[in-house]
């Protein structure tokens, strides 16, 4: 058993049919020394007598808040949630497995840049009696700060008559180096409770590989005299990292029919222009990522070439 | 929310078999877990099994164990109550009721509860 917050304590129950539980001892936080009674959530069944009541927490239903009181007046509570293992394996039934990049993936991160700043996000079909808190470090031995906010509710989808709802926050290293090598990763720990349940998920990385640069901003098209070629033109967005002759990206122009079938052209440039056909009905695109190492393209830039 | 309609229920001999079902529609991936209660007139609501929707995972009352079998079929949304060696004394309304919590045998952790069907048991 360990404290999770003031007077919320968590039980580590490794369960299995016939599990015999463990055991828990919870003291009344008073001076008093007699006349004290123990009850259970709005139960009003005197559990036990005394400063201290031993448990035996084999099930959900031996969690929740316990109570002493005496003459009835409320000296403390106590809520016991339950941290549940079946099989050696911690329980994961808060979040949805977003199984991208891989199966088990529950947290998702990504950074715009190379400031030391990233978002991360889950997914839930829960709606209600959930809390979240998110905390992080760069290296778990002799961890050096980051400072996460509030986990906020970010988006609601229905897929089909599921409910899918999307958490995320906001986390920002206290002393970011964006030109220095990372050689420890960034760790991400979110506690999640739902009801009486307490689970745990981590996620750890380097900021270099969850690198999402924002698409390139000011796409234009300049047509070129006396031909079907067009000059395209954009520019590093705004989010990312400077200067940008250190902090370069290279970009892919995707010349794209109106039907899907149609084949795509794609030029690769690490210049902010590039010439290319522009046929009727087609739109042109453009994406960018780093130059020097291969993390995740950012979305589209597009614009009709008419 | 989950929606639950338990049947199955009847008149049997003690030392007799009876299966319950309870179909489930609606947003049944919100809740882990589906358990079987029963109430005997002027009793409150007591525990007998549950089951995982998922992994199969079982969790019996003491008065349960060896004579009930709670199983589930996913593909028809449907949990089983296999009673067998019925006694006068399992002659109750019997409910189930979808929960986050699984194990937990408190009602209070239960919802989305079916309209029960009736098991009487005659000697």
């Known amino acids: 058993i360990w404290e999770l917050k003031k007077d919320v304590y968590v039980v580590e129950l490794d369960w299995y049919p016939d599990a015999p539980g463990e055991m828990v001892v919870l003291t009344c936080d008073t001076p008093e020394e007699d006349g004290i009674t123990w009850t259970l959530d709005q139960s009003s069944e005197v559990l036990g007598s005394g400063k201290t009541l031993t448990i035996q927490v084999k099930e959900f239903g031996d969690a929740g808040q316990y109570t002493c009181h005496k003459g009835g007046e409320v000296l403390s509570h106590s809520l016991l949630l339950l941290h549940k293992k079946e099989d050696g394996i911690w329980s994961t039934d808060i979040l949805k497995d977003q199984k991208e990049p891989k199966n088990k993936t529950f947290l998702r991160c990504e950074a715009k840049n190379y400031s030391g700043r990233f978002t991360c996000w889950w997914l839930t079909t829960i709606s209600t009696d959930l809390t979240f808190s998110v905390k992080s470090s760069r290296g778990s031995s002799d961890p050096q700060g980051v400072t996460c906010g509030a986990a906020t509710l970010s988006a609601e989808r229905v897929r089909g008559d599921n409910k899918e709802y999307e958490y995320s926050v906001e986390c920002q290293e206290d002393s970011a180096c964006p030109a220095a090598e990372e050689s420890l990763p960034i760790e991400v720990m979110v506690d999640a409770v739902h009801k009486l349940k307490y689970e745990n998920y981590t996620s750890s990385f380097f900021i270099r590989d969850i690198i999402k640069p924002d698409p390139p901003k000011n796409l234009q098209l300049k047509p070129l005299k006396n031909s079907r070629q067009v000059e395209v033109s954009w520019e590093y967005p705004d989010t990312w990292s400077t200067p940008h002759s250190y902090f370069s990206l290279t970009f892919c122009v995707q010349v794209q029919g109106k039907s899907k079938r149609e084949k795509k052209d794609r030029v690769f440039t690490d210049k902010t222009s590039a010439t290319v056909i522009c046929r009727k009905n087609a739109s042109i695109s453009v994406r960018a990522q780093d130059r020097y190492y291969s993390s995740s393209w950012s979305e589209w830039a597009s614009v009709p070439c008419s | 929310e989950v929606q639950l309609v338990e049947s199955g229920g009847g008149l049997v001999q003690a030392g007799g078999s009876l299966r319950l079902s309870c179909a489930a529609s609606g947003r049944t991936f919100s809740s882990d877990a589906v358990g079987w209660f029963r109430q005997a007139p002027g009793l409150e609501r007591v525990f007998v099994a549950a089951i995982r929707w998922s992994g199969g995972s079982a969790y019996y009352a003491d008065s349960a164990k060896g004579r009930f079998t709670i199983s589930r079929d996913n593909a028809k949304n449907t949990v089983y109550l296999q009673m067998n060696s019925l006694k006068p004394e399992d002659t109750a309304v019997y409910y189930c009721?979808?929960?986050?919590?699984?194990?937990?045998?408190?009602?209070?952790?239960?919802?989305?509860w079916g309209q029960g069907t009736q098991v009487t048991v005659s000697s």
């Open positions: 009721g979808a929960t986050s919590l699984f194990p937990s045998s408190r009602g209070s952790h239960y919802d989305s």
